[in-house]
Structures are given as structure tokens and as C-alpha cells.
């Protein structure tokens, strides 16, 4: 629903970081946390991290899952720790608002 969309919020959250952009760090700080899954040549590549600036993740977080990619976003310290992005299963619809979690 429209009113469930996260508002621009300068607060920074600690996020779990796992993936190519994390370097040697296992956490990052940003205005949103995410958990993503992409299919690379048929192999599942899971990543977690943060968007430093809210606008950075705005469009990504609104994008519904596709057969090759899914992103779930949240706001709250370590909120992406127990989130695992999942691809849509056949016959289910995934409106963009369903993959945003507020904590």
C-alpha cells in the first residue's frame, strides 16, 4: 500500500554485509539494508548489504522479483540478518510493496 512506503530517513542502520561489495567487512552502515539473490549462469548468488543513501535503493527495493533476481529491503539495525531473498514461485504475484520490511 502507498502509505507503507518508507519515508526518507536520515537515520543510519547497521546491516549485515555479505558479497562482492563488502571487502573484508561483515557489516556496513546505511539508510537501508538489503538481501538479494541473483542467478548467474544458473547459480544462486546471495548478497547482503546496505544502501548508503535512501535514493540509491529506492528503485531497487521497489522492483518486483523476476526469474533472475530478487531484492528485499528493510530499515532497522541488522534487519537483513534473517532475510533471505527468494525468487517468485510460479503462479504467485509479487507486487513491489511486498518485498519491503520495516522494523
Amino acid at each position: 500500500m502507498e502509505d507503507e512506503k518508507p519515508k526518507v530517513n536520515p537515520k543510519l542502520y547497521m546491516c549485515v554485509c555479505e558479497g562482492l561489495s563488502c571487502g573484508n567487512e561483515d557489516h556496513c552502515e546505511g539508510q537501508q539494508c538489503f538481501s538479494s539473490l541473483s542467478i548467474n549462469d544458473g547459480f544462486h548468488v546471495y548478497q547482503k548489504g546496505c544502501f548508503q543513501v535512501y535514493e540509491q535503493g529506492k528503485m531497487t527495493c521497489k522492483t518486483p522479483p523476476s526469474p533472475g533476481q530478487a531484492v528485499e529491503c528493510c530499515q532497522g539495525d541488522w534487519c537483513n540478518r534473517n532475510i533471505t531473498a527468494q525468487l517468485p514461485t510460479k503462479g504467485k504475484s509479487f507486487p513491489g510493496t511486498q518485498n519491503f520490511h520495516l522494523e
Epitope: 562482492l20 542467478i39 548467474n40 549462469d41 544458473g42 547459480f43 544462486h44 548468488v45 548478497q47 526469474p67
Partner: antibody, heavy 118, light 106 residues
Framework: EVQLVESGGGLVQPGGSLRLSCAAS????????MYWIRQAPGKGLEWVSS????????YYADSVKGRFTISRDNSKNTVYLQMNSLRAEDTAVYYC???????????WGQGTLVTVSS | DIQMTQSPSSLSASVGDRVTISCKAS??????LNWFQQKPGEAPKLLIY???SLQTGIPSRFSGSGSGTDFTLTISSLQPEDFAIYFC????????FGPGTKVEIK
């Protein structure tokens, strides 16, 4: 127990075709991506192709793109590799494999030998 | 494509030895790396996934470490059944295997 059994290998002339099959059992086949990996005699391993759960998305190594086609029949718990325009360098043992989402290539079949020679 | 290199290409060791095999990626692959063992006439067998996670049923003498471009497979105390070829495999992008490391009896 997960079982993957490949068949269909054999001797074929350059330019010829062959269709490999991999019969799966011991797991819910339609829930898993499937893969073909090959190994030339005395050589290393090479990923060949992947297919998603419903067969709607397929992926190929550049070396086989346009010549090989991966497909699956979930009602028969079988994945296939149709190989056309075969070359001597396609000679290899072809393995079928499965992943779990978190564990790539967790299970392999015993392989089937394809020999391309005149 | 991401290139994978392994060193050494072969090594001789005795039962009970600690064995270390290195795998290097040509670019950052984070922890998207598996280790496989292959014995003559057999299919490869998964030992380690996601760089350092031990596959179910694999003895704890096998361990993996590394992130980014440098990875290591360690066998803490080599057993007679461990003489084989070991391959690393990356699935970060354009899946590729390393050329293999043959572990032979000294």
C-alpha cells in the same frame, strides 16, 4: 538418497549429434536447477549448461552456445543435453549435477563418455 | 571470464601430513567458491561450499578458508583415502573450475 544417472554417450563423427539424458531420483526434481559439467580425458572440469526449475531459463558456456540445448521433463524427472555440430574438442565425460540453492553442485552423476572422432 | 589458478599443481605427502592447497581468482569472487575431490574413474565430490562450509558427511579434517581472491583448502591429517585430485570452483560470474591439484603418496 539422491541419484543421478546419465546415459546416451557414445562414439559420434565430427558434425554429428547426440542426446544425453540424466534420470534423477531421491529428491523433488522440479524444485531444483540442474547442470551439465564435462571433463575431457585427463583434463580439468568445465561447466557446460544450466537450466532452471521449469525449463524457462537456460544458460550455456560460450564454447557450446548455439550447438547444445539443455531441456528437462519434470514429469519424467529427467534433464537432457542435445548436442549438435559436435567437434573433436567436445570429447569428454559429461556429468549431470544438481544444486541446492545454498550449495552449488552438491550432487553429481557417474558420467557418460562422449567421443567425437572420425 | 574469471580465471582460477591452483598451486601446487601436484604434491607428494605422507599419511598424517598437513596439506594445504591454494586457489586464486583473477578477480574478487567474495566467498562464492567450492572445493571438490575427484578420484580416478569417479565423479567429483563436494567437500567445501561457500569457501568455508563443510558439506554434510565430509570428515572434519577438511577445511576451507579465504575470501575475495585467495582461498585455501587444508587437510589437517592426510588419510590414505585422501590421495586424489582437488579442484576449486567459482560461481560468482561465468562459472569456472581451477585446473586441479594432484595429491600423491610420497
Amino acid at each position: 538418497e539422491v541419484q543421478l544417472v546419465e546415459s546416451g554417450g557414445g562414439l559420434v563423427q565430427p558434425g554429428g549429434s547426440l542426446r544425453l539424458s540424466c534420470a534423477a531420483s531421491g529428491f523433488t526434481f522440479s524444485n531444483y536447477y540442474m547442470y551439465w559439467i564435462r571433463q575431457a580425458p585427463g583434463k580439468g572440469l568445465e561447466w557446460v549448461s544450466s537450466i532452471n526449475t521449469d525449463g524457462g531459463s537456460t544458460y550455456y558456456a560460450d564454447s557450446v552456445k548455439g550447438r547444445f540445448t539443455i531441456s528437462r521433463d519434470n514429469s519424467k524427472n529427467t534433464v537432457y543435453l542435445q548436442m549438435n555440430s559436435l567437434r573433436a574438442e567436445d570429447t569428454a565425460v559429461y556429468y549431470c549435477a544438481k544444486s541446492t540453492p545454498n550449495i552449488p553442485l552438491a550432487y553429481w552423476g557417474q558420467g557418460t563418455l562422449v567421443t567425437v572422432s572420425s | 571470464d574469471i580465471q582460477m589458478t591452483q598451486s601446487p599443481s601436484s604434491l607428494s605427502a605422507s599419511v598424517g601430513d598437513r596439506v594445504t592447497i591454494s586457489c586464486k581468482a583473477s578477480q574478487n569472487i567474495y566467498k562464492y567458491l567450492n572445493w571438490f575431490q575427484q578420484k580416478p574413474g569417479e565423479a567429483p565430490k563436494l567437500l567445501i561450499y561457500y569457501s568455508n562450509s563443510l558439506q554434510t558427511g565430509i570428515p572434519s579434517r577438511f577445511s576451507g578458508s579465504g575470501s575475495g581472491t585467495d582461498f585455501t583448502l587444508t587437510i589437517s591429517s592426510l588419510q590414505p583415502e585422501d590421495f586424489a585430485i582437488y579442484f576449486c570452483f567459482q560461481y560468482s560470474s561465468g562459472p569456472t573450475f581451477g585446473p586441479g591439484t594432484k595429491v600423491e603418496i610420497k
